[in-house]
Structure formats: structure tokens, C-alpha cells
């Protein structure tokens, strides 16, 4: 009986070892299949829509990255509260797993749009450098399913790049007008979102806890209408120290108001940036190294 029990234990240990080996092989096979599939799907630089089929839905780009898909491009995601899936660009560089929520690159899209467009999202969801706004509804679904870090990549017309990063980026729902909440800042571009660059201007320049405004839905703290004057939808205060949805100009500009693509703490109010990428990833993101 004792021999039988020992033999049972030995066989169990062997089974466990075999299970581990099979699992490792499965992971390797999956990785190779995915690499093969993605290479097949990567039809050049411009159109980067990647169809993974309906095998599995993903809640954000970090899940896609950690499932072995390492190619940047447009994928379909469905956050927890979201009633439907939607397309988003996943940036699998810079550590990987970034869900791109906004992009400005060339002024090809009109960002002077109304509440419904900003709520649902608009723009080019096909091309790698296509400009878009993911949609406030989708931002809400994304940022209430996990703690996210917002990273903003900025570039000017003189080939300089800076970034700003905020922990715990949150967007409220339609009932509280997609209110913005951000946490601790880090980066090289300066803290234009929370307006911490100067205590005296914070009361009117900070975007923290501001509701979203568009030309047809004014929720700012200004007697006039910031969105109308600045020709974009944004979390305006009275009015802004950052407006990444502003009018696309080529660098320094003159206009009735500071309505360009502005990040005050880097280039001030009268310089419109060349490119912007706003992207999010879970605070505690750990790449799955297979």
C-alpha cells in the first residue's frame, strides 16, 4: 500500500511536470502563430487595422500586448462597462500596451466639433498617423475599469519632443459632463493640465476637475464660451493652459484667441504644436515577457 501511495505521488509529480512543459509549448506555439498572423496582417505602413477575429475581446491595449500581439496598429477593444466594442490605435512601442485616445499630426481632421461628436468620437481610425478623438463615452468606460496613467507625447516643428505623464487619469460620465481628474505629474513638458506651474493662475488655468465643453455645450468657468472662442472641445476652465484639440497651425501663430494646439509650459500660448499623442496604460502595467 505504501509503495502504491509513493508511486501515485511520483506519477502526480510527473503529470505536473508534463503539464508545465505542455503549457510552455502552448505559449510558444501561440506566440509564433501570433507573430505569423500579425506579419501577414501588417500590409505596410499606412493602413494598420489589425483584425484578430472574435476569438477574444480585450478591454484595452495592455491586454492585447500581454496576449502576445506586439505590432502597433488599430485593434478592437471593449472596456468593462462599454455596450459595444470600438476601434483604437494601440501603441506597442514605448514599453507597449498603450491605448491611444487622441492624436494630432497634420491638421487633416476638424476638431471644432459639437458635443455629440466629442462624446462618441471622430476622426481617422484607419491610418497610422490619422488624427482622432476616441470619444468621451469611451474614455469614461476605459478609465473606470482600472487605474490608468495618461502619457502625452508632444513634438514641435523644430524636431524637439517632450512628454507629460499623469497618474490616475479619469473621465466622468455623461451625467457629470465627462469631468477630468488627474493625479501626480511627471515628465519634461511641464504640468499644463493641473496648472501647477504658477499658483496665481491655477484658479483659472487648471484643467483638473473641469467638465468637458464644446461650442454647443458650455460647462466652463468663463463668462463667454471657451470652446467657441478656441474652436475645439476640451476640459476648459477660463480658458486653458493646455488645449490639445486646438486649431492646427504651423508653430508660432497669431489669432484673435490662443486657439492653437497649446501646451503652455513648453511653448506658451502662441505656439501650436506639430504633433500630439494622448495615450493611456494601467498604472501597474507589467509587460508579459513570454
Amino acid at each position: 500500500l505504501e509503495d502504491c501511495a509513493q508511486e501515485q505521488m511520483r506519477l502526480r509529480a510527473q503529470v505536473r511536470l508534463l503539464e508545465t512543459r505542455v503549457k510552455q509549448q502552448q505559449v510558444k506555439i501561440k506566440q509564433l502563430l501570433q507573430e505569423n498572423e500579425v506579419q501577414f496582417l501588417d500590409k505596410g505602413d499606412e493602413n494598420t487595422v489589425i483584425d484578430l477575429g472574435s476569438k477574444r475581446q480585450y478591454a484595452d491595449c495592455s491586454e492585447i500586448f500581454n496576449d502576445g500581439y506586439k505590432l502597433s496598429g488599430f485593434y478592437k477593444i471593449k472596456p468593462l462597462q462599454s455596450p459595444a466594442e470600438f476601434s483604437v490605435y494601440c501603441d506597442m512601442s514605448d514599453g507597449g500596451g498603450w491605448t491611444v485616445i487622441q492624436r494630432r499630426s497634420d491638421g487633416s481632421e476638424n476638431f471644432n466639433r459639437g458635443w455629440k461628436d466629442y462624446e462618441n468620437g471622430f476622426g481617422n481610425f484607419v491610418q497610422k498617423h490619422g488624427e482622432y478623438w476616441l470619444g468621451n463615452k469611451n474614455l469614461h468606460f476605459l478609465t473606470t475599469q482600472e487605474d490608468y496613467t495618461l502619457k502625452i507625447d508632444l513634438a514641435d516643428f523644430e524636431k524637439n519632443s517632450r512628454y507629460a505623464q499623469y497618474k490616475n487619469f479619469k473621465v466622468g460620465d455623461e451625467k457629470n459632463f465627462y469631468e477630468l481628474n488627474i493625479g501626480e505629474y511627471s515628465g519634461t513638458a511641464g504640468d499644463s493640465l493641473a496648472g501647477n506651474f504658477h499658483p496665481e493662475v491655477q484658479w483659472w488655468a487648471s484643467h483638473q476637475r473641469m467638465k468637458f465643453s464644446t461650442w454647443d455645450r458650455d460647462h466652463d468657468n468663463y463668462e463667454g464660451n471657451c470652446a467657441e472662442e478656441d474652436q475645439s472641445g476640451w476640459w476648459f476652465n477660463r480658458c486653458h493652459s493646455a488645449n490639445l484639440n486646438g486649431v492646427y497651425y504651423s508653430g508660432p501663430y497669431t489669432a484673435k484667441t490662443d486657439n492653437g494646439i497649446v501646451w503652455y509650459t513648453w511653448h506658451g500660448w502662441w505656439y501650436s504644436l506639430k504633433s500630439v499623442v494622448m495615450k493611456i496604460r494601467p498604472n501597474d502595467f507589467i509587460p508579459n515577457v513570454i
Epitope: 477574444r56 475581446q57 484595452d60 471593449k78 473606470t144 482600472e146 455623461e174
Partner: antibody
């Protein structure tokens, strides 16, 4: 540490109403949805609905639309569920939960007994 | 509503044994499935999310897998604290729905 602390057991008469609570701690209450779930004695689980504390927005399982009212008090980080026109069918343990992508936290449950 | 059919409804097993529970979804849920454990004292804990990802702090003897519309929870070697009730939960669409549960008992 995230915690959801639910109120104690309730014994209520048929036809009456009861309001049970779920006090959140260890995180910013207004950031995340709170869901409610029902479990009848010795039976399985049923989803009742959710509330988003940031705005008070709610959504219900059709089955509980006229039964459960979900509210929050952000000043005390507490979610409430009021059950009305109680019958023996409402005798159950009610759970609140915070369900995120990478974590889920459940309250310990509140037993509501409907008896004459 | 999506129906989740869980089997078996009860299961007797010995310590060290390997067991599997299954849930079948009546519609496509694309991997939006969790496995929950309810202890005899009523406390509930999520073990697995997205069909196969282990929640933080959950022992590695638990694993989740999927084959089409069938989702499985496997415990590779049962320990005394694993004897409890287990439920699957689909969160692909509202209303969220649960499997009927599996009572896992000591043989």
C-alpha cells in the same frame, strides 16, 4: 486596502421597505462603479444593477427595475440599495462589489429576511 | 439575456485530486468570464478574469481555459481550503449572469 463594509442583517415585514448600505474605503469612492448582487438562501447569484458614484447614474437588471433603488452618499463614501414592497421572494443575502479589470472586491453581504 | 450553464452542480473529490468545472455560454461572450469562489462563511472572491488570467494572490493550482463557448476552471491538486462553492460570471453584456454554481465537497 480596498474594503466594502456592508450593514448588518435586517428582519422586515412583507410590504415594507429596507435600505442597506455598503461603505467603501481604501480608494476614491467616486472613481468606480458599484454593483449589487442577490443570493437567495441555498441558491445562485443574480446581478441587480450598478451605480456610478461619480454622478449617481444607474442601470438595472430589468427584473429588479421596480424593486431596487440604488443611491450613493459621496460625503461618506457609501452606496445604498433600497428594496421596496418586500415579499418572501426578497429574502436573500445582498452583496455589493467593485469589479475592475485586474481586481474585484466584494462586501461581506447583508442578509434581508422578510417575515410576518 | 445570456444563459450560463454550469456543470457539475456538485462534485466530491479527495485532497490532491485534479478537478475541472465547466460553464457554457448561450451566446458569444468572447472571453469575458470570471470564476468566483464562495466559502462556507459566505465570503466571495474572484479567482480568474478574462477566462484564463489569475487574480492577484490566487494560488497557481487554479487555472482557467476556454474552448469555443465552453469555459473551464481546473484545480490541479485540491487542498482543504478549496472545498467551497464555485460560480462562473459572464460580464460581456448586461445583465451580467452567473452559472448555477458547483458545490465542491470532500470525498
Amino acid at each position: 486596502e480596498v474594503q466594502l463594509q456592508q450593514s448588518g442583517p435586517e428582519l422586515v415585514k412583507p410590504g415594507a421597505s429596507v435600505k442597506i448600505s455598503c461603505k467603501a474605503s481604501g480608494y476614491t469612492f467616486t472613481d468606480y462603479y458599484i454593483n449589487w448582487v442577490k443570493q437567495k438562501p441555498g441558491q445562485g447569484l443574480e446581478w441587480i444593477g450598478w451605480i456610478y458614484p461619480g454622478s449617481g447614474n444607474t442601470d438595472h437588471n430589468e427584473k429588479f427595475k421596480d424593486k431596487a433603488t440604488l443611491t450613493v452618499d459621496t460625503s461618506s463614501s457609501t452606496a445604498y440599495m433600497q428594496l421596496s414592497s418586500l415579499t418572501s421572494e426578497d429574502t436573500a443575502v445582498y452583496f455589493c462589489l467593485r469589479f475592475l479589470l485586474r481586481s474585484a472586491y466584494w462586501g461581506q453581504g447583508t442578509l434581508v429576511t422578510v417575515s410576518a | 439575456d445570456i444563459q450560463m450553464t454550469q456543470s457539475p452542480s456538485s462534485l466530491s473529490a479527495s485532497l490532491g485530486e485534479r478537478v475541472s468545472l465547466t460553464c457554457r455560454a448561450s451566446q458569444e461572450i468572447s472571453g469575458y468570464l470570471s470564476w468566483l469562489q464562495q466559502k462556507p462563511d459566505g465570503t466571495i472572491k474572484r479567482l480568474i478574469y478574462a477566462a484564463s488570467t489569475l487574480d492577484s494572490g490566487v494560488p497557481k493550482r487554479f487555472s482557467g481555459s476556454r474552448s469555443g463557448s465552453d469555459y473551464s476552471l481546473t484545480i490541479s491538486s485540491l487542498e482543504s481550503e478549496d472545498f467551497a462553492d464555485y460560480y462562473c460570471l459572464q460580464y460581456a453584456s448586461y445583465p451580467w449572469t452567473f452559472g448555477g454554481g458547483t458545490k465542491l465537497e470532500i470525498k
